[in-house]
Protein backbone atom coordinates (compact mmCIF):
# COMPACT_ATOMS: atom_id res chain seq x y z
CA UNK A 1 0.00 0.00 0.00
CA UNK A 2 1.15 3.52 -0.81
CA UNK A 3 2.21 5.59 2.20
CA UNK A 4 -0.58 7.88 3.48
CA UNK A 5 0.36 11.55 3.13
CA UNK A 6 -2.52 12.88 5.31
CA UNK A 7 -2.36 13.96 8.96
CA UNK A 8 -4.52 10.96 9.83
CA UNK A 9 -4.55 7.65 8.01
CA UNK A 10 -6.93 4.69 8.16
CA UNK A 11 -5.79 1.78 10.27
CA UNK A 12 -7.65 -1.45 9.84
CA UNK A 13 -11.38 -1.40 9.14
CA UNK A 14 -12.40 1.13 11.78
CA UNK A 15 -9.23 2.71 13.09
CA UNK A 16 -7.41 5.97 12.49
CA UNK A 17 -3.76 6.85 13.18
CA UNK A 18 -2.62 10.46 13.41
CA UNK A 19 1.17 10.44 13.82
CA UNK A 20 2.52 13.13 11.49
CA UNK A 21 4.38 15.64 13.69
CA UNK A 22 2.38 18.71 14.68
CA UNK A 23 -0.39 18.13 12.16
CA UNK A 24 -3.30 18.49 14.61
CA UNK A 25 -4.33 21.15 17.08
CA UNK A 26 -7.83 19.72 17.62
CA UNK A 27 -9.82 16.60 16.79
CA UNK A 28 -12.52 18.38 14.79
CA UNK A 29 -13.66 16.92 11.50
CA UNK A 30 -11.73 13.66 11.65
CA UNK A 31 -12.50 11.61 8.54
CA UNK A 32 -15.03 8.78 9.01
CA UNK A 33 -15.54 9.69 12.65
CA UNK A 34 -18.98 8.06 13.05
CA UNK A 35 -17.67 4.53 12.58
CA UNK A 36 -14.34 4.82 14.32
CA UNK A 37 -13.70 2.36 17.12
CA UNK A 38 -9.98 3.12 17.53
CA UNK A 39 -8.14 6.42 17.40
CA UNK A 40 -4.36 6.63 17.80
CA UNK A 41 -2.70 10.05 18.08
CA UNK A 42 1.01 10.65 18.59
CA UNK A 43 3.49 13.53 18.36
CA UNK A 44 0.86 16.29 18.30
CA UNK A 45 2.48 19.07 20.35
CA UNK A 46 -0.25 21.54 19.35
CA UNK A 47 -3.05 19.33 20.65
CA UNK A 48 -3.31 20.86 24.12
CA UNK A 49 -7.02 20.64 24.99
CA UNK A 50 -9.55 17.86 24.73
CA UNK A 51 -13.10 19.12 25.07
CA UNK A 52 -16.68 17.98 24.63
CA UNK A 53 -16.94 19.15 21.01
CA UNK A 54 -13.74 17.36 20.01
CA UNK A 55 -15.21 13.89 20.34
CA UNK A 56 -18.75 14.65 19.19
CA UNK A 57 -19.78 12.07 16.61
CA UNK A 58 -17.35 9.42 17.87
CA UNK A 59 -20.10 7.39 19.47
CA UNK A 60 -18.56 4.02 18.56
CA UNK A 61 -15.09 4.81 19.88
CA UNK A 62 -13.66 2.04 22.11
CA UNK A 63 -9.94 2.82 22.21
CA UNK A 64 -8.43 6.29 22.39
CA UNK A 65 -4.69 6.85 22.51
CA UNK A 66 -3.15 10.31 22.68
CA UNK A 67 0.56 9.92 23.50
CA UNK A 68 3.70 11.99 23.30
CA UNK A 69 1.65 15.08 22.59
CA UNK A 70 1.02 18.44 24.25
CA UNK A 71 -2.21 17.60 26.06
CA UNK A 72 -2.54 19.88 29.10
CA UNK A 73 -6.25 19.80 29.82
CA UNK A 74 -9.05 17.26 29.46
CA UNK A 75 -12.50 18.70 30.12
CA UNK A 76 -14.64 16.90 32.71
CA UNK A 77 -17.27 16.22 30.05
CA UNK A 78 -14.83 15.43 27.21
CA UNK A 79 -16.03 11.83 26.86
CA UNK A 80 -19.75 12.51 27.11
CA UNK A 81 -20.25 11.46 23.48
CA UNK A 82 -18.07 8.35 23.72
CA UNK A 83 -19.91 6.17 26.24
CA UNK A 84 -18.38 2.94 24.87
CA UNK A 85 -14.81 4.01 25.55
CA UNK A 86 -12.99 1.18 27.35
CA UNK A 87 -9.29 1.95 26.81
CA UNK A 88 -7.81 5.40 27.32
CA UNK A 89 -4.10 6.03 26.99
CA UNK A 90 -2.97 9.61 27.71
CA UNK A 91 0.63 8.82 28.59
CA UNK A 92 3.55 11.20 28.03
CA UNK A 93 1.57 14.42 27.78
CA UNK A 94 1.58 17.58 29.89
CA UNK A 95 -1.34 16.66 32.18
CA UNK A 96 -1.05 17.92 35.74
CA UNK A 97 -4.49 16.67 36.75
CA UNK A 98 -7.54 14.81 35.49
CA UNK A 99 -10.99 15.27 36.98
CA UNK A 100 -12.92 12.31 38.39
CA UNK A 101 -15.81 13.52 36.25
CA UNK A 102 -13.85 12.78 33.10
CA UNK A 103 -14.04 9.03 33.65
CA UNK A 104 -17.39 8.97 35.44
CA UNK A 105 -19.92 6.94 33.50
CA UNK A 106 -17.28 5.14 31.46
CA UNK A 107 -16.42 1.49 31.94
CA UNK A 108 -12.69 1.84 31.48
CA UNK A 109 -10.76 -1.39 31.48
CA UNK A 110 -7.52 0.50 31.00
CA UNK A 111 -6.41 4.00 31.87
CA UNK A 112 -2.77 4.93 31.17
CA UNK A 113 -1.41 8.22 32.56
CA UNK A 114 2.29 7.49 33.05
CA UNK A 115 4.80 10.08 31.87
CA UNK A 116 2.62 13.08 32.81
CA UNK A 117 3.82 15.77 35.28
CA UNK A 118 0.95 14.99 37.64
CA UNK A 119 0.45 17.36 40.56
CA UNK A 120 -0.56 15.56 43.76
CA UNK A 121 -3.71 17.13 45.17
CA UNK A 122 -7.12 16.05 46.37
CA UNK A 123 -8.27 16.27 42.76
CA UNK A 124 -6.31 13.05 42.14
CA UNK A 125 -7.70 11.22 45.16
CA UNK A 126 -9.94 9.22 42.80
CA UNK A 127 -6.88 8.07 40.85
CA UNK A 128 -5.10 7.13 44.05
CA UNK A 129 -8.16 5.04 44.91
CA UNK A 130 -7.99 3.31 41.53
CA UNK A 131 -4.39 2.50 42.29
CA UNK A 132 -5.33 1.11 45.71
CA UNK A 133 -8.17 -0.95 44.29
CA UNK A 134 -6.27 -2.25 41.26
CA UNK A 135 -8.54 -0.64 38.71
CA UNK A 136 -7.81 0.12 35.08
CA UNK A 137 -4.26 -1.16 35.17
CA UNK A 138 -3.23 1.89 37.22
CA UNK A 139 -1.08 0.10 39.85
CA UNK A 140 1.35 -1.23 37.24
CA UNK A 141 2.13 2.33 36.11
CA UNK A 142 3.66 3.35 39.48
CA UNK A 143 2.40 6.88 38.90
CA UNK A 144 4.58 9.71 40.21
CA UNK A 145 3.63 13.25 41.12
CA UNK A 146 6.05 15.76 39.63
CA UNK A 147 8.65 16.53 42.30
CA UNK A 148 6.40 15.05 45.01
CA UNK A 149 7.01 11.34 44.86
CA UNK A 150 4.65 8.43 44.24
CA UNK A 151 0.92 9.11 43.92
CA UNK A 152 0.36 6.23 46.29
CA UNK A 153 2.09 8.20 49.08
CA UNK A 154 -0.03 11.34 48.66
CA UNK A 155 -1.62 12.31 52.01
CA UNK A 156 -5.38 12.04 51.64
CA UNK A 157 -6.80 12.57 55.11
CA UNK A 158 -8.41 15.85 54.11
CA UNK A 159 -9.57 14.61 50.72
CA UNK A 160 -13.23 13.91 51.23
CA UNK A 161 -16.33 14.33 49.13
CA UNK A 162 -18.78 16.95 50.43
CA UNK A 163 -20.76 16.20 53.58
CA UNK A 164 -24.51 16.70 53.25
CA UNK A 165 -27.16 17.16 55.90
CA UNK A 166 -30.77 17.44 54.81
CA UNK A 167 -33.20 18.89 57.32
CA UNK A 168 -36.73 17.56 56.96
CA UNK A 169 -39.83 18.38 59.01
CA UNK A 170 -39.65 16.55 62.32
CA UNK A 171 -43.33 15.67 62.20
CA UNK A 172 -45.62 14.28 59.58
CA UNK A 173 -47.03 16.54 56.91
CA UNK A 174 -50.62 16.73 55.74
CA UNK A 175 -51.95 16.86 52.20
CA UNK A 176 -51.99 20.48 51.01
CA UNK A 177 -49.21 21.59 53.35
CA UNK A 178 -45.98 23.27 52.30
CA UNK A 179 -42.72 21.60 53.28
CA UNK A 180 -39.36 23.34 53.55
CA UNK A 181 -36.28 21.16 53.13
CA UNK A 182 -32.79 22.51 53.65
CA UNK A 183 -29.57 20.88 52.46
CA UNK A 184 -26.45 21.98 54.31
CA UNK A 185 -23.25 21.29 52.37
CA UNK A 186 -19.83 21.15 54.00
CA UNK A 187 -16.44 20.36 52.58
CA UNK A 188 -13.47 21.77 50.77
CA UNK A 189 -13.45 23.00 47.18
CA UNK A 190 -17.20 22.88 46.69
CA UNK A 191 -18.05 23.21 43.01
CA UNK A 192 -21.71 22.44 42.41
CA UNK A 193 -24.78 21.34 44.31
CA UNK A 194 -28.45 20.85 43.60
CA UNK A 195 -31.58 18.78 44.02
CA UNK A 196 -32.71 15.70 42.08
CA UNK A 197 -36.49 15.71 41.95
CA UNK A 198 -37.20 13.27 39.14
CA UNK A 199 -39.50 11.10 41.26
CA UNK A 200 -41.75 13.95 42.36
CA UNK A 201 -43.75 14.56 39.17
CA UNK A 202 -47.16 15.86 40.32
CA UNK A 203 -46.53 15.29 44.02
CA UNK A 204 -45.96 18.96 44.85
CA UNK A 205 -45.14 22.36 43.43
CA UNK A 206 -41.38 22.80 43.65
CA UNK A 207 -39.50 26.01 44.44
CA UNK A 208 -35.72 26.04 44.84
CA UNK A 209 -33.88 28.71 46.79
CA UNK A 210 -30.41 29.56 48.01
CA UNK A 211 -27.09 28.17 46.87
CA UNK A 212 -23.91 26.75 48.31
CA UNK A 213 -23.46 26.04 51.15
CA UNK A 214 -27.19 26.02 52.02
CA UNK A 215 -29.81 24.96 49.50
CA UNK A 216 -33.50 25.40 50.18
CA UNK A 217 -36.36 23.49 48.62
CA UNK A 218 -40.03 24.25 49.17
CA UNK A 219 -42.51 21.56 48.25
CA UNK A 220 -45.81 23.42 48.12
CA UNK A 221 -49.32 21.97 48.26
CA UNK A 222 -48.05 18.42 48.71
CA UNK A 223 -50.15 15.43 47.69
CA UNK A 224 -50.22 11.93 49.13
CA UNK A 225 -48.19 10.81 46.10
CA UNK A 226 -45.14 12.41 47.72
CA UNK A 227 -44.90 9.44 50.10
CA UNK A 228 -42.04 7.03 49.42
CA UNK A 229 -40.57 9.39 46.81
CA UNK A 230 -36.90 10.30 47.08
CA UNK A 231 -35.88 13.93 47.30
CA UNK A 232 -32.13 13.96 46.71
CA UNK A 233 -29.57 16.63 47.50
CA UNK A 234 -26.23 16.34 45.71
CA UNK A 235 -22.95 18.19 45.82
CA UNK A 236 -19.62 17.87 44.05
CA UNK A 237 -16.08 18.96 44.73
CA UNK A 238 -12.77 18.04 43.12
CA UNK A 239 -12.71 14.75 45.04
CA UNK A 240 -16.10 13.45 43.98
CA UNK A 241 -19.84 13.57 44.39
CA UNK A 242 -22.09 12.99 47.39
CA UNK A 243 -25.83 12.38 47.44
CA UNK A 244 -28.31 12.17 50.29
CA UNK A 245 -31.91 11.14 49.74
CA UNK A 246 -34.79 11.80 52.12
CA UNK A 247 -38.48 11.06 52.05
CA UNK A 248 -41.32 13.16 53.40
CA UNK A 249 -44.17 11.40 55.19
CA UNK A 250 -47.52 12.82 54.09
CA UNK A 251 -50.45 11.65 56.17
CA UNK A 252 -53.75 10.82 54.48
CA UNK A 253 -56.85 8.79 55.32
CA UNK A 254 -57.26 5.05 54.98
CA UNK A 255 -58.89 3.65 51.86
CA UNK A 256 -59.70 0.09 50.84
CA UNK A 257 -60.69 -1.92 47.78
CA UNK A 258 -61.90 -5.52 47.55
CA UNK A 259 -61.98 -7.70 44.46
CA UNK A 260 -63.76 -10.88 43.46
CA UNK A 261 -62.41 -14.04 45.05
CA UNK A 262 -60.07 -16.06 42.84
CA UNK A 263 -58.97 -19.65 43.17
CA UNK A 264 -55.21 -20.07 43.33
CA UNK A 265 -53.31 -22.58 45.46
CA UNK A 266 -55.72 -21.39 48.15
CA UNK A 267 -58.71 -19.21 47.49
CA UNK A 268 -57.86 -15.53 47.65
CA UNK A 269 -60.05 -12.49 48.24
CA UNK A 270 -57.75 -9.80 46.82
CA UNK A 271 -57.62 -6.39 48.50
CA UNK A 272 -55.74 -3.12 48.31
CA UNK A 273 -55.37 -0.75 51.25
CA UNK A 274 -53.79 2.65 51.32
CA UNK A 275 -53.21 5.38 53.87
CA UNK A 276 -50.42 6.97 55.82
CA UNK A 277 -49.73 5.81 58.42
CA UNK A 278 -50.49 2.28 57.30
CA UNK A 279 -54.04 1.39 58.32
CA UNK A 280 -54.95 -1.34 60.75
CA UNK A 281 -57.21 -3.99 59.21
CA UNK A 282 -60.13 -6.04 60.43
CA UNK A 283 -62.24 -8.59 58.55
CA UNK A 284 -65.95 -9.20 59.08
CA UNK A 285 -67.78 -12.28 57.85
CA UNK A 286 -71.55 -11.78 57.48
CA UNK A 287 -71.26 -8.77 59.80
CA UNK A 288 -69.37 -10.49 62.60
CA UNK A 289 -65.67 -10.22 63.41
CA UNK A 290 -63.70 -12.84 61.51
CA UNK A 291 -61.01 -14.35 63.71
CA UNK A 292 -58.11 -15.44 61.55
CA UNK A 293 -56.82 -19.00 61.77
CA UNK A 294 -54.30 -21.14 59.93
CA UNK A 295 -57.09 -21.85 57.43
CA UNK A 296 -58.26 -18.24 56.96
CA UNK A 297 -55.62 -15.54 57.19
CA UNK A 298 -54.44 -12.22 55.77
CA UNK A 299 -51.38 -12.32 53.56
CA UNK A 300 -49.63 -9.27 52.12
CA UNK A 301 -47.74 -9.16 48.85
CA UNK A 302 -44.27 -7.64 48.80
CA UNK A 303 -44.81 -3.87 48.90
CA UNK A 304 -43.55 -1.65 46.12
CA UNK A 305 -40.72 0.54 47.37
CA UNK A 306 -42.14 3.75 45.96
CA UNK A 307 -45.79 3.65 47.04
CA UNK A 308 -47.87 3.37 50.20
CA UNK A 309 -50.60 1.13 48.83
CA UNK A 310 -50.46 -2.46 50.05
CA UNK A 311 -51.93 -5.38 48.16
CA UNK A 312 -52.81 -8.70 49.65
CA UNK A 313 -55.25 -11.57 50.00
CA UNK A 314 -57.56 -12.99 52.55
CA UNK A 315 -56.41 -16.58 52.06
CA UNK A 316 -58.92 -19.39 52.51
CA UNK A 317 -57.57 -22.92 52.58
CA UNK A 318 -60.08 -25.28 50.91
CA UNK A 319 -63.21 -23.32 51.82
CA UNK A 320 -66.60 -25.05 51.79
CA UNK A 321 -70.18 -23.81 51.58
CA UNK A 322 -69.97 -22.69 55.22
CA UNK A 323 -67.49 -20.04 54.09
CA UNK A 324 -69.88 -18.60 51.51
CA UNK A 325 -71.06 -15.15 52.47
CA UNK A 326 -70.35 -11.47 52.77
CA UNK A 327 -66.74 -10.46 53.50
CA UNK A 328 -66.00 -6.93 54.70
CA UNK A 329 -62.59 -5.39 55.13
CA UNK A 330 -62.36 -2.48 57.58
CA UNK A 331 -59.31 -0.21 57.40
CA UNK A 332 -58.58 2.62 59.80
CA UNK A 333 -55.77 5.05 60.48
CA UNK A 334 -55.69 8.32 62.41
CA UNK A 335 -57.13 10.28 59.51
CA UNK A 336 -59.96 8.12 58.30
CA UNK A 337 -61.68 4.78 58.16
CA UNK A 338 -62.96 2.89 55.16
CA UNK A 339 -64.66 -0.38 54.39
CA UNK A 340 -65.43 -2.53 51.39
CA UNK A 341 -67.56 -5.65 51.08
CA UNK A 342 -67.84 -8.49 48.62
CA UNK A 343 -69.95 -11.63 48.33
CA UNK A 344 -67.95 -14.82 47.94
CA UNK A 345 -69.34 -18.22 46.95
CA UNK A 346 -66.77 -20.98 47.11
CA UNK A 347 -68.99 -24.07 46.91
CA UNK A 348 -72.65 -24.89 46.61
CA UNK A 349 -74.27 -26.35 49.71
CA UNK A 350 -74.66 -30.05 48.90
CA UNK A 351 -77.48 -30.37 51.43
CA UNK A 352 -79.69 -27.71 49.88
CA UNK A 353 -81.53 -29.33 46.99
CA UNK A 354 -85.07 -29.47 45.68
CA UNK A 355 -86.88 -32.85 46.16
CA UNK A 356 -87.86 -32.63 42.48
CA UNK A 357 -84.16 -32.48 41.46
CA UNK A 358 -82.28 -35.64 40.52
CA UNK A 359 -80.70 -37.18 43.61
CA UNK A 360 -76.89 -37.11 43.60
CA UNK A 361 -75.55 -40.57 44.10
CA UNK A 362 -71.85 -39.98 44.33
CA UNK A 363 -69.68 -37.07 45.50
CA UNK A 364 -66.76 -36.29 47.75
CA UNK A 365 -67.60 -36.41 51.44
CA UNK A 366 -68.17 -33.37 53.62
CA UNK A 367 -67.82 -33.59 57.38
CA UNK A 368 -71.28 -32.61 58.54
CA UNK A 369 -70.14 -32.52 62.17
CA UNK A 370 -68.14 -29.37 61.55
CA UNK A 371 -69.94 -26.36 63.00
CA UNK A 372 -67.10 -23.88 62.92
CA UNK A 373 -66.34 -21.56 60.05
CA UNK A 374 -63.07 -23.32 59.47
CA UNK A 375 -62.74 -25.22 56.23
CA UNK A 376 -62.79 -28.99 56.36
CA UNK A 377 -59.98 -31.10 55.01
CA UNK A 378 -60.96 -33.89 52.61
CA UNK A 379 -59.53 -37.04 54.07
CA UNK A 380 -60.81 -39.56 51.54
CA UNK A 381 -61.66 -39.05 47.91
CA UNK A 382 -63.55 -42.39 47.58
CA UNK A 383 -67.13 -41.82 46.36
CA UNK A 384 -69.96 -43.23 48.41
CA UNK A 385 -73.70 -43.56 47.91
CA UNK A 386 -76.46 -41.60 49.58
CA UNK A 387 -80.01 -42.78 50.12
CA UNK A 388 -82.58 -40.09 50.67
CA UNK A 389 -86.14 -40.85 51.71
CA UNK A 390 -88.48 -38.19 50.42
CA UNK A 391 -91.73 -38.06 52.38
Amino acid sequence: AAPCPDACCPHGSSGLRCTRDGALDSLHHLPGAENLTELYIENQQHLQHLELRDLRGLGELRNLTIVKSGLRFVAPDAFHFTPRLSRLNLSFNALESLSWKTVQGLSLQELVLSGNPLHCSCALRWLQRWEEEGLGGVPEQKLQCHGQGPLAHMPNASCGVPTLKVQVPNASVDVGDDVLLRCQVEGRGLEQAGWILTELEQSATVMKSGGLPSLGLTLANVTSDLNRKNVTCWAENDVGRAEVSVQVNVSFPASVQLHTAVEMHHWCIPFSVDGQPAPSLRWLFNGSVLNETSFIFTEFLEPAANETVRHGCLRLNQPTHVNNGNYTLLAANPFGQASASIMAAFMDNPFEFNPEDPIPVSFSPVDTNSTSGDPVEKKDETPFGVSVAVG
Partner: antibody, heavy 123, light 106 residues
Framework: EVQLLESGGGLVQPGGSLRLSCAAS????????MSWVRQTPGKRLEWVAY????????YYPDTVKGRFTISRDNSKNTLYLQMNSLRAEDTAVYYC????????????????WGQGTTVTVSS | QIVLTQSPATLSLSPGERATLSCSAS?????MHWYQQKPGQSPRLLIY???NLASGIPSRFSGSGSGTDFTLTISSLEPEDAADYYC?????????FGGGTKLEIK
Amino acid sequence: EVQLLESGGGLVQPGGSLRLSCAASGFTFSTYTMSWVRQTPGKRLEWVAYISKGGGSTYYPDTVKGRFTISRDNSKNTLYLQMNSLRAEDTAVYYCAKGAMYGNDFFYPMDYWGQGTTVTVSS
Amino acid sequence: QIVLTQSPATLSLSPGERATLSCSASSSVSYMHWYQQKPGQSPRLLIYTTSNLASGIPSRFSGSGSGTDFTLTISSLEPEDAADYYCHQWSSYPWTFGGGTKLEIK
Protein backbone atom coordinates in the same frame (compact mmCIF):
# COMPACT_ATOMS: atom_id res chain seq x y z
CA GLU B 1 -45.02 30.93 76.83
CA VAL B 2 -47.68 29.20 74.74
CA GLN B 3 -51.07 30.89 75.02
CA LEU B 4 -54.35 29.98 73.38
CA LEU B 5 -57.34 32.24 73.92
CA GLU B 6 -60.77 31.15 72.70
CA SER B 7 -63.68 33.51 72.08
CA GLY B 8 -67.03 33.60 70.32
CA GLY B 9 -69.05 31.27 72.53
CA GLY B 10 -72.53 32.06 73.74
CA LEU B 11 -76.19 31.07 73.75
CA VAL B 12 -77.69 30.10 70.40
CA GLN B 13 -80.95 28.52 69.31
CA PRO B 14 -81.05 25.08 67.66
CA GLY B 15 -80.35 25.44 63.94
CA GLY B 16 -78.34 28.59 64.55
CA SER B 17 -74.68 29.36 63.86
CA LEU B 18 -71.63 30.51 65.80
CA ARG B 19 -68.04 31.24 64.89
CA LEU B 20 -65.37 30.52 67.47
CA SER B 21 -61.90 32.06 67.33
CA CYS B 22 -58.66 31.08 69.00
CA ALA B 23 -55.81 33.60 69.19
CA ALA B 24 -52.43 31.90 69.50
CA SER B 25 -49.17 33.31 70.80
CA GLY B 26 -45.84 32.14 72.19
CA PHE B 27 -45.04 29.72 69.35
CA THR B 28 -44.70 29.67 65.57
CA PHE B 29 -48.35 29.12 64.78
CA SER B 30 -47.88 28.16 61.12
CA THR B 31 -45.67 25.17 61.95
CA TYR B 32 -48.16 23.31 64.15
CA THR B 33 -51.37 21.43 63.54
CA MET B 34 -54.36 22.61 65.54
CA SER B 35 -57.56 20.99 66.80
CA TRP B 36 -60.83 21.82 68.50
CA VAL B 37 -61.97 19.57 71.35
CA ARG B 38 -65.17 19.98 73.33
CA GLN B 39 -66.19 18.94 76.83
CA THR B 40 -69.84 18.15 77.42
CA PRO B 41 -71.68 19.08 80.61
CA GLY B 42 -71.14 15.46 81.66
CA LYS B 43 -67.38 16.12 81.40
CA ARG B 44 -66.83 13.83 78.39
CA LEU B 45 -64.12 15.01 76.00
CA GLU B 46 -64.87 14.82 72.27
CA TRP B 47 -62.55 15.67 69.40
CA VAL B 48 -64.34 18.03 67.01
CA ALA B 49 -61.95 19.12 64.24
CA TYR B 50 -58.33 19.06 63.07
CA ILE B 51 -56.46 21.27 60.63
CA SER B 52 -53.00 20.82 59.16
CA LYS B 53 -50.21 23.35 59.45
CA GLY B 54 -50.95 25.06 56.16
CA GLY B 55 -54.68 24.49 56.28
CA GLY B 56 -54.68 22.13 53.32
CA SER B 57 -56.11 19.17 55.25
CA THR B 58 -59.04 19.13 57.66
CA TYR B 59 -60.65 16.20 59.47
CA TYR B 60 -63.86 15.89 61.48
CA PRO B 61 -65.74 13.11 63.27
CA ASP B 62 -69.03 12.06 61.69
CA THR B 63 -71.00 13.82 64.44
CA VAL B 64 -70.07 17.28 63.13
CA LYS B 65 -69.02 16.58 59.51
CA GLY B 66 -70.86 18.87 57.11
CA ARG B 67 -71.93 21.25 59.89
CA PHE B 68 -68.62 22.46 61.35
CA THR B 69 -65.70 23.98 59.43
CA ILE B 70 -62.24 24.50 60.87
CA SER B 71 -59.94 27.09 59.29
CA ARG B 72 -56.87 29.12 60.16
CA ASP B 73 -55.22 32.39 59.25
CA ASN B 74 -51.50 31.92 59.75
CA SER B 75 -50.81 35.60 59.13
CA LYS B 76 -53.03 36.46 62.11
CA ASN B 77 -52.06 33.47 64.27
CA THR B 78 -55.73 32.64 64.60
CA LEU B 79 -57.74 29.41 64.46
CA TYR B 80 -61.48 29.39 63.70
CA LEU B 81 -64.42 27.02 64.04
CA GLN B 82 -67.56 27.86 62.07
CA MET B 83 -70.50 25.96 63.56
CA ASN B 84 -73.76 25.74 61.60
CA SER B 85 -77.03 23.85 62.14
CA LEU B 86 -76.29 23.68 65.85
CA ARG B 87 -78.05 21.07 67.98
CA ALA B 88 -78.67 20.72 71.68
CA GLU B 89 -76.02 17.99 71.86
CA ASP B 90 -73.39 20.49 70.67
CA THR B 91 -73.66 22.24 74.04
CA ALA B 92 -70.17 22.12 75.56
CA VAL B 93 -67.02 23.99 76.48
CA TYR B 94 -64.93 24.27 73.29
CA TYR B 95 -61.17 24.16 73.61
CA CYS B 96 -58.63 24.95 70.95
CA ALA B 97 -55.54 22.74 71.24
CA LYS B 98 -52.08 22.82 69.71
CA GLY B 99 -50.66 19.67 68.13
CA ALA B 100 -47.37 18.48 69.58
CA MET B 101 -44.34 17.53 67.50
CA TYR B 102 -42.43 14.63 68.97
CA GLY B 103 -40.25 13.22 66.22
CA ASN B 104 -41.49 12.01 62.88
CA ASP B 105 -44.60 10.43 64.28
CA PHE B 106 -48.23 10.50 63.20
CA PHE B 107 -49.62 9.83 66.64
CA TYR B 108 -48.77 13.07 68.36
CA PRO B 109 -51.09 14.37 71.04
CA MET B 110 -52.27 17.90 71.86
CA ASP B 111 -49.79 19.48 74.20
CA TYR B 112 -51.39 22.86 74.99
CA TRP B 113 -55.06 23.72 75.44
CA GLY B 114 -56.81 27.05 75.81
CA GLN B 115 -59.13 27.88 78.71
CA GLY B 116 -62.21 27.17 76.61
CA THR B 117 -65.32 29.05 75.51
CA THR B 118 -68.83 27.90 76.39
CA VAL B 119 -71.41 27.19 73.71
CA THR B 120 -75.00 26.63 74.81
CA VAL B 121 -77.58 25.49 72.27
CA SER B 122 -81.06 25.90 73.68
CA SER B 123 -84.42 27.30 72.71
CA GLN C 1 -64.83 3.87 66.40
CA ILE C 2 -62.49 2.81 69.17
CA VAL C 3 -64.13 3.06 72.57
CA LEU C 4 -61.84 3.78 75.53
CA THR C 5 -63.09 2.52 78.89
CA GLN C 6 -61.39 3.90 82.00
CA SER C 7 -61.44 2.24 85.38
CA PRO C 8 -62.13 2.85 88.11
CA ALA C 9 -64.52 5.74 87.58
CA THR C 10 -63.43 7.14 90.94
CA LEU C 11 -60.31 6.40 92.96
CA SER C 12 -59.85 7.64 96.49
CA LEU C 13 -56.36 7.32 98.00
CA SER C 14 -54.14 8.93 100.58
CA PRO C 15 -50.98 10.99 99.98
CA GLY C 16 -47.93 8.77 99.46
CA GLU C 17 -49.98 5.88 98.11
CA ARG C 18 -49.59 4.44 94.63
CA ALA C 19 -52.35 5.09 92.10
CA THR C 20 -53.02 2.83 89.13
CA LEU C 21 -55.46 4.06 86.49
CA SER C 22 -56.50 1.77 83.64
CA CYS C 23 -57.66 2.43 80.12
CA SER C 24 -59.00 -0.37 77.94
CA ALA C 25 -59.48 0.05 74.18
CA SER C 26 -62.15 -1.80 72.21
CA SER C 27 -59.55 -2.46 69.47
CA SER C 28 -55.78 -2.44 69.42
CA VAL C 29 -54.16 1.01 69.26
CA SER C 30 -50.59 2.06 68.56
CA TYR C 31 -50.21 4.49 71.43
CA MET C 32 -52.11 6.07 74.30
CA HIS C 33 -51.87 9.63 75.60
CA TRP C 34 -52.94 10.77 79.07
CA TYR C 35 -54.28 14.14 80.22
CA GLN C 36 -54.88 15.63 83.66
CA GLN C 37 -57.68 18.11 84.29
CA LYS C 38 -58.00 19.94 87.57
CA PRO C 39 -61.28 21.63 88.56
CA GLY C 40 -61.84 24.85 86.61
CA GLN C 41 -58.82 24.24 84.36
CA SER C 42 -58.26 22.93 80.85
CA PRO C 43 -56.71 19.52 80.23
CA ARG C 44 -52.93 19.24 80.48
CA LEU C 45 -50.79 16.69 78.68
CA LEU C 46 -49.18 14.23 81.12
CA ILE C 47 -47.95 11.27 79.06
CA TYR C 48 -47.60 11.01 75.29
CA THR C 49 -47.19 7.93 73.10
CA THR C 50 -47.87 5.55 76.00
CA SER C 51 -44.81 6.10 78.18
CA ASN C 52 -43.17 9.47 77.48
CA LEU C 53 -43.37 12.15 80.14
CA ALA C 54 -44.54 15.53 78.84
CA SER C 55 -42.53 18.65 79.59
CA GLY C 56 -42.73 19.84 83.20
CA ILE C 57 -44.51 16.72 84.51
CA PRO C 58 -43.06 15.22 87.71
CA SER C 59 -41.33 11.85 87.39
CA ARG C 60 -43.81 10.19 89.77
CA PHE C 61 -46.11 9.91 86.74
CA SER C 62 -45.49 7.04 84.33
CA GLY C 63 -47.35 5.27 81.56
CA SER C 64 -47.24 1.75 80.17
CA GLY C 65 -49.19 -0.76 78.13
CA SER C 66 -49.76 -1.89 74.57
CA GLY C 67 -52.49 -3.19 72.31
CA THR C 68 -55.74 -2.71 74.18
CA ASP C 69 -54.61 -2.27 77.78
CA PHE C 70 -52.84 0.82 79.09
CA THR C 71 -52.00 2.10 82.54
CA LEU C 72 -51.17 5.44 84.11
CA THR C 73 -49.29 5.08 87.38
CA ILE C 74 -48.61 7.71 90.03
CA SER C 75 -45.94 6.23 92.27
CA SER C 76 -46.45 8.40 95.35
CA LEU C 77 -49.52 10.62 95.48
CA GLU C 78 -49.31 14.31 96.31
CA PRO C 79 -52.34 16.39 97.33
CA GLU C 80 -52.12 18.39 94.07
CA ASP C 81 -52.68 15.21 92.06
CA ALA C 82 -56.41 15.37 92.78
CA ALA C 83 -57.93 15.72 89.33
CA ASP C 84 -59.73 13.99 86.48
CA TYR C 85 -57.51 11.84 84.24
CA TYR C 86 -58.34 11.04 80.63
CA CYS C 87 -56.77 8.62 78.19
CA HIS C 88 -56.79 9.50 74.49
CA GLN C 89 -56.07 7.57 71.29
CA TRP C 90 -55.02 9.08 67.99
CA SER C 91 -54.26 5.78 66.30
CA SER C 92 -57.57 5.29 64.59
CA TYR C 93 -60.14 7.73 63.25
CA PRO C 94 -62.14 9.19 64.89
CA TRP C 95 -59.86 10.21 67.74
CA THR C 96 -61.46 9.35 71.04
CA PHE C 97 -61.09 9.96 74.77
CA GLY C 98 -61.89 7.77 77.73
CA GLY C 99 -64.69 8.70 80.09
CA GLY C 100 -62.18 9.73 82.75
CA THR C 101 -61.11 8.62 86.20
CA LYS C 102 -61.70 10.98 89.10
CA LEU C 103 -58.79 10.79 91.56
CA GLU C 104 -59.56 12.01 95.05
CA ILE C 105 -56.93 12.51 97.72
CA LYS C 106 -58.16 11.76 101.22
